[in-house]
Interface confidence: medium
């Protein structure tokens, strides 16, 4: 069975200046994803993100999540690239705290 | 049945630039990344950069000013491009498949092209 | 750069016996971005061992993974003469994705 990510992108204040933006996948089967920040559309190096672990969310699926450190105002410039079961989608960072999309296959 | 065939010259001249063709099969490129990879008796294994599926490029800062990698999903084919070779990139350069999932594990390589750079 | 030393850089086993090798990461990865790869001679590598402790397709249950942060092992619990072979870590936690040095198998 495929069950396609909920991508969810939220923000939050990490210093003056700065904004920590956090991409999270829940509720995907199987656990096979890749998830990743890009800035005007170019991968973002590793050493800039980070990774939390692929982990069961307790229903048969599973969630997992990257984060980046970036500059308050720049945030267009940002956008969460997930591959999942041959498939791809590109999730901007929200205007506002929280923005919540379902991938259609 | 998965593969990867590279085709590509043997011998470079100092300076010049070398052009590798990595020909997939048993898989498309629309849906699985692909890294390149090289090996030398000097530095050991070293990771060039990679394609993912949608053509946006990562690159190994090392070799960012002269490597550019692309492809042609239509004809199955990728291509790594480096200029300004010196000796010491003389090795055996693999294009390899990204494993989906397997956390950018490289699931499936191909020959190697044998490189030799000198005049 | 993320160092990865592997050690012994040679380890000779007898048929049988039990091994461990090391790879030893000059700063944390995540076990989710650590695999090993067995090079045979005029071969291409292959994947061996995915994400710390799982086995790629068709490789061996002798064969076994383990660690966590900086520490990391392979072990095979019952030497064959198909395992003879270069075995190579990997980190892909921070870009430049890197490899170790590789430890060589033999047989004793």
């Known amino acids: 069975r495929r069950v396609p990510p909920m991508v969810n992108v939220t923000r939050s204040e990490a210093s003056e200046g700065n904004i920590t933006v956090t991409c999270r996948a829940s509720s995907f089967y199987p656990r096979n994803i890749t998830l990743t920040w890009r800035q005007d559309g170019v991968s973002l190096s590793h050493d800039t993100q980070q990774w939390g672990d692929v982990l069961p969310d307790g229903n048969g699926t599973y969630q997992t999540w990257v984060a980046t450190r970036i500059c308050q105002g720049e945030e267009q410039r940002f956008t969460c690239y997930m591959e999942h079961s041959g498939n791809h989608s590109t999730h901007p960072v929200p205007s506002g705290k929280v923005l919540v999309l379902q991938s259609h296959w | 049945q998965v593969q990867l065939k590279q085709s590509g010259p043997g011998l470079v001249q100092p300076s010049q630039s070398l052009s590798i063709t990595c020909i997939v099969s048993?898989?498309?490129?629309?849906?699985?990344?692909v890294h390149w990879v090289r090996q030398s008796p000097g530095k050991g294994l070293e990771w060039l950069g990679m394609?993912?599926?949608?053509?946006?490029?990562d690159y190994n800062a090392a070799f960012i000013s002269r490597l550019s990698i692309n492809k042609d999903n239509s004809k199955s084919q990728v291509f790594l491009k480096m200029n300004s070779l010196q000796a010491d990139d003389t090795g055996i350069y693999y294009c390899?498949?990204?494993?989906?999932?397997?956390?950018?594990?490289?699931?499936?390589w191909g020959q190697g092209t044998s490189v030799t750079v000198s005049s | 750069q993320i160092l990865l030393t592997q050690s012994p850089a040679i380890l000779s086993a007898s048929l049988g016996e039990r091994v461990t090798m090391t790879c030893t990461a000059s700063?944390?990865?995540?076990?989710?971005?650590l695999h090993w790869y067995q090079q045979k001679p005029g071969s291409s590598p292959k994947l061996w061992i995915y994400s710390t402790s799982n086995l790629a397709s068709g490789v061996p249950a002798r064969f076994s993974g383990g660690g966590s942060g900086t520490s990391y092992s392979l072990t095979v619990s019952n030497m064959e003469a198909e395992d003879a072979a270069t075995y190579y870590c990997?980190?892909?936690?921070?870009?430049?994705?890197?490899f170790g040095s590789g430890t060589k198998l033999e047989i004793k």
């Open positions: 390899v498949r990204k494993g989906h999932g397997y956390y950018y594990a490289m699931d499936y």
């Open positions: 394609i993912w599926t949608d053509g946006t490029t």
């Open positions: 048993g898989f498309s490129l629309t849906t699985y990344g």
């Open positions: 990997h980190q892909y936690h921070r870009s430049p994705f890197t």
């Open positions: 700063s944390s990865v995540s076990s989710s971005y």
